[in-house]
Interface confidence: medium
């Protein structure tokens, strides 16, 4: 049930998309069992969720990846939830780290991030990972979303 | 504070229950510090949360398991959050995967799943795992819930 | 948008703080990109989130830690979300466990906990870990929060 025209529900859940881009920013799509409540939240350039209204949002991301200790850098796999607000510096909101598995050819692991943050109108959130080529894109494994309180 | 009779709070949090059943669907109970806000969400057959009202729900599950690489299949431990709606195919909403530990006799790991999804009246959500015998049922380790936005 | 004076938004997100205390209870601070919606939720003694209003809350914590199997006890690293209410028993709401990594000097891992619980006026929630010295306090790695439904 909607909260009313003055205070509509705002929520999104988008699905990971494999990308040939070399950027560390994950790509997302409105596909499968996705959620996009209305135009008060949008997926921009397949990479960031942008909100039109100021307020408190619960923002979350889940990333499943497959890596091997020998084939990867010594640094762990890190997923970061980042914020970009108009006229402000980018900043990290949340991060999670998992050391690479010794399983061969690679070992799967899942990371979940989530927290409550104040967003300004026009603010965008996106997800960065240390190695996008290790991310698993099978059904349900990697997703990203938010909901306005 | 309730939102009013027209728009009551709808939320549930149920606790894992060990089961002798060989099914991959996890069993849950209204025990311990559980939540069941009202009859607009119910736990059916100890295995699925069913909602009476259409709307956006944040649905989550946490599964802790103990496994060993040598004693398990080569495939990772996978937890899946699944949806069954009246007159529709079952579908996977979220999945997480963790490679088995090399620790002996087994190594504990925890998986967390969560996302925002549109549910129809009569829709049910449930949790599947690759090997229910590996799931940890100690206080607080494995739980499942939802809240209506 | 606020829900109105009768039913204001209540939410918090606090950031981990390294502590010289030997207690297993994690310490938190209102620093960085934190959230504290109003005085209906407060951070007390840097260790617990205390609410003034009864109701259903989604409570979450994320803990990133770095440990090594050889240098740690055989028991896994466990993070517990605990509840303390006036005139009631303390109790564990949620727990997650991760076996220590074999990576050297230590392997990073992240744990996420979250669930919906009924809190009484004056109830406090806090996070316990088996070894606070292993917790990672870099930007975004370890945080704790709640939101009232």
């Amino acid at each position: 049930m909607q909260k009313g025209d003055q205070n509509p529900q705002i929520a999104a859940h988008v699905i990971s998309e494999a990308s040939s881009k070399t950027t560390s920013v994950l790509q997302w799509a409105e596909k499968g069992y996705y959620t996009m409540s209305n135009n008060l939240v949008t997926l921009e350039n397949g990479k960031q969720l942008t909100v039109k209204r100021q307020g408190l949002y619960y923002i979350y991301a889940q990333v499943t990846f497959c890596s091997n200790r020998e084939a990867s850098s010594q640094a762990p796999f890190i997923a970061s939830l980042c914020l970009k607000s108009p006229g402000r510096f980018e900043r990290i909101l949340l991060r999670a780290a998992n050391t690479h598995s010794s399983a061969k050819p690679c070992g799967q692991q899942s990371i979940h991030l989530g927290g409550v943050f104040e967003l300004q109108p026009g603010a965008s959130v996106f997800v960065n990972v240390t190695d996008p080529s290790q991310v698993s894109h099978g059904t349900g494994f990697t997703s990203f979303g938010l909901l306005k309180l | 504070m309730q939102k009013g009779d027209q728009n009551p709070q709808i939320a549930a949090h149920v606790i894992s229950e060990a089961s002798s059943k060989t099914t991959s669907v996890l069993q849950w109970a209204e025990k311990g510090y559980y939540t069941m806000s009202n009859n607009l969400v119910t736990l059916e057959n100890g295995k699925q949360l069913t909602v009476k009202r259409q709307g956006l729900y944040y649905i989550y599950a946490q599964v802790t398991f103990c496994s060993n690489r040598e004693a398990s299949s080569q495939a990772p431990f996978i937890a899946s959050l699944c949806l069954k709606s009246p007159g529709r195919f079952e579908r996977i909403l979220l999945r997480a995967a963790n490679t088995h530990s090399s620790a002996k006799p087994c190594g504990q790991q925890s998986i967390h799943l969560g996302g925002v999804f549109e549910l129809q009246p009569g829709a049910s959500v449930f949790v599947n795992v690759t090997d229910p015998s590996q799931v940890s049922h100690g206080t607080g380790f494995t739980s499942f819930g939802l809240l209506k936005l | 948008m606020q829900k109105g004076d009768q039913n204001p938004q209540i939410a918090a997100h606090v950031i981990s703080e390294a502590s010289s205390k030997t207690t297993s209870v994690l310490q938190w601070a209102e620093k960085g990109y934190y959230t504290m919606s109003n005085n209906l939720v407060t951070l007390e003694n840097g260790k617990q989130l205390t609410v003034k209003r009864q109701g259903l809350y989604y409570i979450y914590a994320q803990v990133t830690f770095c440990s090594n199997r050889e240098a740690s006890s055989q028991a896994p690293f466990i993070a517990s979300l605990c509840l303390k209410s006036p005139g009631r028993f303390e109790r564990i709401l949620l727990r997650a466990a991760n076996t220590h990594s074999s990576a050297k000097p230590c392997g990073q891992q992240s744990i996420h906990l979250g669930g919906v619980f009924e809190l009484q006026p004056g109830a406090s929630v806090f996070v316990n870990v088996t070894d606070p010295s292993q917790v990672s306090h870099g930007t975004g790695f370890t945080s704790f929060g709640l939101l009232k439904l």
Partner: nanobody
């Protein structure tokens, strides 16, 4: 009928020890969390320690490392071993059964512990 009967209180010197017992009847101890609260003169009743049916134990910060809670299901009795007692531990100690979501559902009548030289 559910009943909780405490015993073992008394006068003890600082640094001394006492063991409180809580004999339960009318229910099976192993199905419930059990615990101890205390109320000092002029203060609110406060949580001391508890043990769940799973065997998990909890302690107030003020007693950690000094007090130990245990239960003997065969005797349907819960215990509180109190070591290194301090004057500030002086209070009436109450045994309680946990109704879980709804808090304590049964209390004992209390036993007085006085720590004084």
């Amino acid at each position: 009928e559910v009943q909780l009967v405490e015993s073992g209180g008394g006068l003890v010197q600082p640094g001394g020890s006492l063991r409180l017992s809580c004999a339960a009847s009318g229910f099976t101890l192993g199905n419930y969390a059990m615990g101890w609260f205390r109320q000092a003169p002029g203060k609110e009743r406060e949580f001391v320690a508890s043990i769940t049916s799973y065997g998990d134990t909890y302690y107030a910060d003020s007693v950690k490392g000094r007090f130990t809670i245990s239960a003997d299901n065969s005797k349907n009795t819960a215990y509180l071993q109190m070591n290194s007692l301090k004057p500030e531990d002086t209070a009436v100690y109450y045994c309680a059964r946990d109704g879980y979501t709804y808090g304590v559902d049964y209390w004992g009548q209390g036993t007085l512990v006085t720590v004084s030289s």
